[in-house]
Interface confidence: low
Amino acid sequence: TPEVWVQVRMEATELSSFTIRCGFLGSGSISLVTVSWGGPNGAGGTTLAVLHPERGIRQWAPARQARWETQSSISLILEGSGASSPCANTTFCCKFASFPEGSWEACGSLPPSSDPGLSAPPTPAPILRAD
């Protein structure tokens, strides 16, 4: 069964800077990845970045750098300054659109006890969406 995993890490050097890593565990080819915060994309969440494996990347503040790590995983660095900066209990979600399986999404956040520089373990929590 396809899965999506999400890691959230607070950078030790910049306590208000976050790195989100997401990956897709499945056999299908990825057609689109959407990263959002505050909840799933389309369900109250706000889009931070859209990554298409062939056609490029869009990102919006406070996203600073979205990139592909592998053909099935991405990372996103968030700026940590200003009113729109993330906080420790912010939920981040990654949605992978994959043909022919459909869209799979998982969310994660920093565990309450996280030390700076440590990451939450991968949290696969796929939701099948027929969109």
């Epitope: 062939e54 056609r55 990347i57 750098q65």
Partner: antibody, heavy 122, light 106 residues
Framework: EVQLVQSGAEVKKPGASVKVSCKAS????????IYWVRQAPGQGLEWMGT????????SYNQKFRGRVTMTRDTSTSTVYMELSSLRSEDTAVYYC???????????????WGQGTLVTVSS | QNVLTQSPATLSLSPGERATLSCSAG?????LHWFQQKPGQAPRLLIY???NLASGVPARFSGSGSGTDYTLTISSLEPEDFAVYYC?????????FGQGTKLEIK
């Protein structure tokens, strides 16, 4: 027939601003993003940024952050690129190109404007 | 930013010959696009997503590669192929182009 028609050549003084227009026709304007590329004389291509014509979102090359603004007018199917605080090194031909919207199939960047020469000189 | 380095800077060949243009990325990219530009004209998309021919592009053009190394090949040069060729990556922001390879008649 798909067409992107850009405004005419401009001569500007250092410190001034320039606003280049790109009028689209022959397709549904809001179905495609528009992106801007510039080319200094005898030089290569440089991506400046992209605007989503359907919801006005923009993504800029950080090199131009704070100086470039891309807007669109859906009533006239026109996209504008404004570059402020001009300097001599901004002298270039500025192109708009029709990009894809993320859910639409290929081709990628398949139509371009004819280019607008902006000369910055005191 | 991801710097794309094209080689050679200039390639001098005769019609009918095979042309091989290279593009090397500073860091790995998923896909690469190739554009052709003739003097006084806007660029024209040739190859998208590494190996796919854009609409109307002759079959003598082909693209290949992965990771950091990509190639554009023209199997048998026609007079209209002499131009400047640019590679472009869209795997990370800002999108970047190579500096170009000028293909000239020998």
């Amino acid at each position: 027939e798909v067409q992107l028609v850009q405004s005419g050549a401009e001569v500007k003084k250092p410190g001034a601003s320039v606003k280049v227009s790109c009028k689209a026709s022959g397709y549904t304007f809001t179905d495609y993003w528009i992106y801007w590329v510039r080319q200094a004389p005898g030089q290569g291509l440089e991506w400046m940024g992209t605007i989503d014509t359907s919801d006005h979102k923009t993504s800029y090359n950080q090199k131009f952050r704070g100086r470039v603004t891309m807007t669109r007018d859906t009533s006239t199917s026109t996209v504008y690129m404004e570059l402020s605080s001009l300097r001599s090194e901004d002298t270039a031909v500025y192109y708009c190109a029709r990009d894809f919207i993320i859910t639409v199939n290929y081709p990628v960047v398949d139509y371009w404007g004819q280019g607008t020469l902006v000369t910055v000189s005191s | 930013q991801n710097v794309l380095t094209q080689s050679p800077a200039t390639l001098s060949l005769s019609p009918g010959e095979r042309a091989t243009l290279s593009c090397s990325a500073g860091s790995s990219v998923n896909y690469l696009h190739w554009f052709q530009q003739k003097p006084g004209q806007a660029p024209r998309l040739l190859i998208y997503s590494t190996s796919n021919l854009a609409s109307g592009v002759p079959a003598r053009f082909s693209g290949s590669g992965s990771g950091t190394d990509y190639t554009l090949t023209i199997s048998s040069l026609e007079p209209e192929d002499f131009a400047v060729y640019y590679c472009q990556q869209r795997s990370s922001l800002p999108f970047t182009f190579g500096q170009g390879t000028k293909l000239e008649i020998k």
